[in-house]
Amino acid sequence: PEPPTACREKQYLINSQCCSLCQPGQKLVSDCTEFTETECLPCGESEFLDTWNRETHCHQHKYCDPNLGLRVQQKGTSETDTICTCEEGWHCTSEACESCVLHRSCSPGFGVKQIATGVSDTICEPCPVGFFSNVSSAFEKCHPWTSCETKDLVVQQAGTNKTDVVCGPQDRLRA
């Protein structure tokens, strides 16, 4: 581990002395001196600082721009930033969630493996043998082919990854 520095945790070194850092939610107004303590002031409305700090300006809360498909997931405080998420049917383009894009739909032949959230896109997977999807959808999984046997029917047309099997009546062979 690094050896300790001349000032303790939650302190900073300035002009040969250790001054207290400002607590989260407050900004630095003036450094301490030999005769005075560090002077801090609370961040204003729509501002925050999330660490012990010596910042002279608070950071502005993130703006969740509805024109970019964003909405507020969690309102910011003096100690935390606003958290944005996307409107229903949309998801963030990055971890910082600065803009949104429409959830992707899975094409015919593909089904939804994982439904999209506000922060992640739809995950599609190809329909395996025995399954199909005949629609473009952001919700539908691959469906299993109809089992003709359980309906006392026979396969008249084989299924594909995009189409279900077609069942038909069994040929009645006369003795």
């Epitope: 050896p3 300790p4 520095t5 001349a6 000032c7 303790r8 070194l13 300035i14 002009n15 040969s16 002395q17 250790c18 450094d31 001196t33 030999e34």
Partner: antibody, heavy 116, light 107 residues
């Protein structure tokens, strides 16, 4: 009154080490940082590092990392600077000073001469 | 590292003169600027801290001013005992750095 008293001049061989002491009096030793400064003959002042005597925490000028080691003994109100692997470049006057809004009180300086 | 520049390395003045010594930092140091006096015998004293705060026991003929990156030390009525080298030092950002010094001599 505040006083900062340093150890006497040293004549040392190249490759060896030297330890300079700095005894403080007239104030609470653990309440103020101790700063160390180098001055080569006819030259300016160069900051070496700082120590907090309360718990021994230090900050060094990158240039002096591995060259200078700062320590402090609370019981005797004395700070120390050890200089290792001495060369002619280390020949200088070394000052200690009490911190607290600038280098508020200085020692008289310790002349270290490195010579074969 | 913050560079401290004292453009005048030596200065001649007469007793009773008003003398100004300047010091410039390579960036804003937020008034964390100190002035030191080094006498010919090598002893060093703090004169002024935080740009303008006179250290205890320092005569009131010494004063300091400045902000941002530009600072100055003024001796309003030069006396014989003021013959010394004067150094500025920034205490805003590690590593602490000093100006090269201004040597004050009597004309």
């Amino acid at each position: 009154q505040v006083q900062v008293q340093q150890s006497g001049a040293e004549l040392v061989r190249p490759g060896t080490s030297v330890k300079v002491s700095c005894k403080a009096s007239g104030y609470a030793f653990t309440n103020y940082l101790i700063e160390w400064v180098k001055q080569r003959p006819g030259q300016g002042l160069e900051w070496i590092g700082v120590i907090n005597p309360e718990f021994g925490g230090t900050n060094y000028n990158e240039k002096f990392k591995g060259k200078a080691t700062l320590t402090a003994d609370k019981s005797s109100s004395t700070a120390y600077m050890q200089l290792s692997s001495l060369t002619s470049e280390d020949s200088a006057v070394y000052f200690c000073a009490r911190g607290g809004g600038g280098f508020t009180y200085w020692g008289q300086g310790t002349l270290v001469t490195v010579s074969a | 590292h913050i560079q401290m520049t004292q453009t005048t390395s030596s200065l001649s003045a007469s007793l009773g003169d008003r003398v100004t010594i300047s010091c410039r930092a390579s960036q804003d140091i937020s008034s964390h600027l100190n002035w030191y006096q080094q006498k010919p015998d090598g002893t060093v004293k703090l004169l002024i801290s935080y740009t303008s705060r006179l250290h205890s026991g320092v005569p009131s003929r010494f004063s300091g001013s400045g902000s941002g990156a530009d600072y100055s030390l003024t001796i309003s009525n030069l006396e014989q005992e003021d013959i010394a080298t004067y150094f500025c030092q920034q205490g805003n950002t590690l590593p602490w750095t000093f100006g090269g010094g201004t040597k004050l001599e009597i004309k």
